[in-house]
Each structure stands twice: as structure tokens, then as C-alpha cells.
Amino acid sequence: RPSFSLVEDTTLEPEEPPTKYQISQPEVYVAAPGESLEVRCLLKDAAVISWTKDGVHLGPNNRTVLIGEYLQIKGATPRDSGLYACTASRTVDSETWYFMVNVTDAISSGDDEDDTDGAEDFVSENSNNKRAPYWTNTEKMEKRLHAVPAANTVKFRCPAGGNPMPTMRWLKNGKEFKQEHRIGGYKVRNQHWSLIMESVVPSDKGNYTCVVENEYGSINHTYHLDVVERSPHRPILQAGLPANASTVVGGDVEFVCKVYSDAQPHIQWIKHVEKNGSKYGPDGLPYLKVLKHSGINSSNAEVLALFNVTEADAGEYICKVSNYIGQANQSAWLTVLPKQQAPGREKEITASPDYLE
């Protein structure tokens, strides 16, 4: 049976445009069961870093070590798989970086970085100095193991030099890599020394070797690609949001709910209310009122703005988000102070959310 009684049965409007919460897949880290995994929070100037897993606060335990900007998971198990986030709290703002952990029997690795530069890797040599091929940017080749979500684009690079200018060819699992070996083929950008595969599928898994050669020698470098298949998940809400707030009578306040969902989410802001002086119905369930929900006529459903508040507005506000897989909810409390007990500012307004793109 439902866990609440709605004071107003809100007829749902058509959903808002579908792309608003379509969030690009975060970086994926893959570990085999039993392995240790270390992830560095890729945020700068972090005064305080907090960690969450699937929207729930993550604290240290006998297998999870949190040191500065590093998260270590010892003896990973499939239960460690999920959506992780590190939030850097600064004096003026906060920023969150999301990443996936997938504990499978696949080889441990990180996602591929898209690299827009690369012209600097095309080195021209003095024609007199004959030279065998050599790597010009080994930093871009350090990450040999790449775990990429299915349907993403992968780029492998082997920046090289030599005189005469070397040629580059690619092997897959030690054999010549031909265009017909994969649906959609692949691109080779010789000037960037790169191999690009779009919309990867599980059959793209394997070892990719670049062979760079000229008449004076040959060098090679091998990358391992693992394609991680996704499965849909229920919405995930950023930990700590909405945040408790206080304001004076007549003030304004905003509650923010940051949503992560592949599938279209439906967002509702709900408040416990009283009916005929009672907070609970005859069935013992609390009375709830839907204050706002996502839909065509609803602007930015992730934010609930309250203006000119009264003491009656005090209480618990719930951000409830559902998609076709399941739902999630988090709540915050609003404290309304009499005017003479004003906090530091007349209006206590939280920052509006950055969309998780």
C-alpha cells in the first residue's frame, strides 16, 4: 500500500523535454574481484573532499581507505560496483566529480580521454639526421588499460617521430586490423598518430598494437580495451542535497536536488502537511502535498523556490525522483525564524544547481 496520503492528487502534466537530465556516462574504473583499486578525485583546490557511493555517504572502513583526494578499495567485490562521487567543498562553492566502479573479471583500467590536440606530436626532423622511430609523448601512452562503456568512442594514440617520418599501422590481437573487422570501421589520424573507434561494442574488446616503423627501425605499443556494458539504474541523488535551510518570516529560500539518471526522471517536491489539524490520515499514513513536479509547465524541477515564507512553511521537504526502474528520495528541513532572530542575512538562498553534464 502507498506509504502516504496525498492531500492533492496532482494530475501529471506531460514530461519536460527529454534531454534535460540525459547525463553523459562518467569515467569507468574496472577491477577484478580481490584486486585493490585506487581512484584520485579529479577536482582542483579542494579544501574538503567527501565521497558517496550510489548517492550514500561513504566513510572509511576495513576495506575502504580515504586519504586526501584518494579513495582506495582493498579486496574489491562486485558489491563495490556502483556510481561514486567525490565532492570538493570550497569556501565559495562545491563541485562534484562522478565515476563508475565495475568489479568484474575484466582487466582493471580507466576510461579513454578524448584528446583534441595532437598536432604537436607530429615532429618534423632535420633531413640530415636519419633516425629510427621513437616515442615523442610517452605520457599519452602510459594508460595501457582502457575500460570504456559500450557505445562510447575510444581513441588510442602513439605519438612518434623519426627520420624519415615513420608510418603507423594497427594490429588487433596481434593480427592486421582491417576496416571490415568491425561494424562502422575505424579512423586512423596519421597526423595525430591515433586510432579512433566510435560506438564500441563488446566484440571490440582486445589488444590493440600500434606499429611505428621506418627504414631504420620499428617500435610498437599495445593497449588493452575492455568494453563495459551498462545496465539501467534508478535515479541517484547527490548526497547532502537538498540541504537544511533557515530563513526569517518573509524571507526567500531555495532547496536544490541534483539528479543523476540515464532514463528520464520524474521529480516531485513533497511536504508533510496537516489536514483538519492532523498530520496523519485514518490509515496512519502521513498527509503529503506535492508542491512541484517535473513537466512542461514546470521550470527547473531540480530547484524548489519558496518566497515570502511564513511559519507554516517550516518543516520537512522531500525531493522524490522516479524513473521506470525505481525511485530515490532525500529530504531537508526548513527552519523559519521570527524576524528579530534573523540569521546573518535576510535571505538565505542556496546556489542553484549545475547540471551534471
Partner: antibody, heavy 114, light 107 residues
Framework: QLQLQQSGAELVKPGASVKMSCKAS????????LHWVKQTPGQGLEWIGL????????SYNQKFKDKATLTADKSSTTAYIQLSSLASEDSAVYFC???????WGQGTTLTVSS | DIVMTQSQKFMSTSVGDRVSVTCKAS??????VAWYQQKPGQSPKALIY???YRYSGVPDRFTGSGSGTDYTLTISSVQAEDLALYYC?????????FGGGTKLELK
């Protein structure tokens, strides 16, 4: 492994009610929606509604609002659909499916006949 | 309600052929579309969700594409076991609606 096991075929008379079950195993039952889908040769697949077992929240297709009642029992990890005031057009195969429609029960055939 | 239209009720194919099953939504549903395969006497089997993501264990000859209102399920090289009924579905907003189905049969 993950499974949705539905109750057996039903033969009922017009005007009666019927309650069919869907027993879930192999996953956290309360954390996923449980959908019900009707299939008839004429109408194809029709979504009836869903229940979120964690808190009992339901969402119905307006077409089935007065026909179907969805419930779930967390302790037995079983979801139920009750169909009332049965008529011949309710004869169909009824499927339950987990949240992402990634796993489906084997279906329960309902025949309404006098 | 959002209407999902599969205009081709039947499609004839041969083993080894490339075939594309299409589906049109009556309004923009983003990438919130799934594809299912159903064989006689069986329950539907999930193939694709969010328009292009293949479920684990689904052969990579099945590819989903599209966004907005037009969606396609492509089988790159049809195998005998692929002869079945294929349904699209929108999981954008309730009521979640299915297409009428496309039956893939041998020429």
C-alpha cells in the same frame, strides 16, 4: 539467479475477481519497480502499471485504473495484481517485469469464460 | 499517451541479411526507448534500452539507434534464432507504451 516466477493459469467466470502473483528472487526486491503488462493477440503489449515495493507507491495506466489493483509484500518478495469485474476482454497473458523491463516472468494466462 | 508506431507488421529476410526494424514515437522521447524480442510461447526478452545500449548477453549483431521520434533496431547478420516478434517501447513517461510489433520471418 534472478527470477520472476508467476502463478499458474486461471479460468474464471465473468464478473468475478482474480489475484495473480509474481515471486521475485535473486535481487533486492524493494529497490526496483515491478511492472505488470497485458498481452492479447489483438492489442499486443499493454502496460498496466507499476508498484515500488519499498514504499508501496503505485502508478497506473488510466485505462486499467478501475480494473487492476497492484500490491507487494516485501517479506515474501512477492507482487500481486488483482483484476476485478472480469469480462471476456480481460482474457490475456499477464506478465510481471522488473524495473528496467530487463527480466520478465513467464506469464500467467487468464481466461474469462462462463 | 505517447503512441509508438511500428509501421511494418511483417518483414521478410534471409539468414545473413542485414535488417532494420523501425519505430516512430508520437512525440519527442529523447533516447528513452527500449527494444524487446519475443518468440512464440515465451515472455519478451530485453535487447536494448535507452535507444542504443545493449543488455549484457545480447549478441552484438543487435544495434539500436535513434533519438527524438525515430528509432531503429538493426540486426547486422540475421541468424535463424532471430526470427521472432520485435517490439519497441518508450520509457519516457507513463503510461509506458509499446509499438504494435514487427514479425521477422524467412523469405
Amino acid at each position: 539467479q534472478l527470477q520472476l516466477q508467476q502463478s499458474g493459469a486461471e479460468l474464471v467466470k465473468p464478473g468475478a475477481s482474480v489475484k495473480m502473483s509474481c515471486k521475485a528472487s535473486g535481487y533486492t526486491f524493494a529497490s526496483y519497480n515491478l511492472h505488470w503488462v497485458k498481452q492479447t493477440p489483438g492489442q499486443g503489449l499493454e502496460w498496466i502499471g507499476l508498484i515500488y515495493p519499498e514504499n508501496g507507491d503505485t502508478s497506473y495506466n488510466q485505462k486499467f485504473k478501475d480494473k487492476a489493483t497492484l500490491t507487494a509484500d516485501k517479506s515474501s518478495t512477492t507482487a500481486y495484481i488483482q483484476l476485478s469485474s472480469l469480462a471476456s476482454e480481460d482474457s490475456a497473458v499477464y506478465f510481471c517485469a522488473r524495473g528496467g523491463f530487463d527480466y520478465w516472468g513467464q506469464g500467467t494466462t487468464l481466461t474469462v469464460s462462463s | 499517451d505517447i503512441v509508438m508506431t511500428q509501421s511494418q507488421k511483417f518483414m521478410s529476410t534471409s539468414v545473413g541479411d542485414r535488417v532494420s526494424v523501425t519505430c516512430k514515437a508520437s512525440q519527442n522521447v529523447g533516447t528513452n526507448v527500449a527494444w524487446y524480442q519475443q518468440k512464440p510461447g515465451q515472455s519478451p526478452k530485453a535487447l536494448i534500452y535507452s535507444a542504443s545500449y545493449r543488455y549484457s548477453g545480447v549478441p552484438d549483431r543487435f544495434t539500436g539507434s535513434g533519438s527524438g521520434t525515430d528509432y531503429t533496431l538493426t540486426i547486422s547478420s540475421v541468424q535463424a534464432e532471430d526470427l521472432a516478434l520485435y517490439y519497441c517501447q518508450q520509457h519516457y513517461s507513463t503510461p509506458y507504451t509499446f509499438g504494435g510489433g514487427t514479425k521477422l520471418e524467412l523469405k
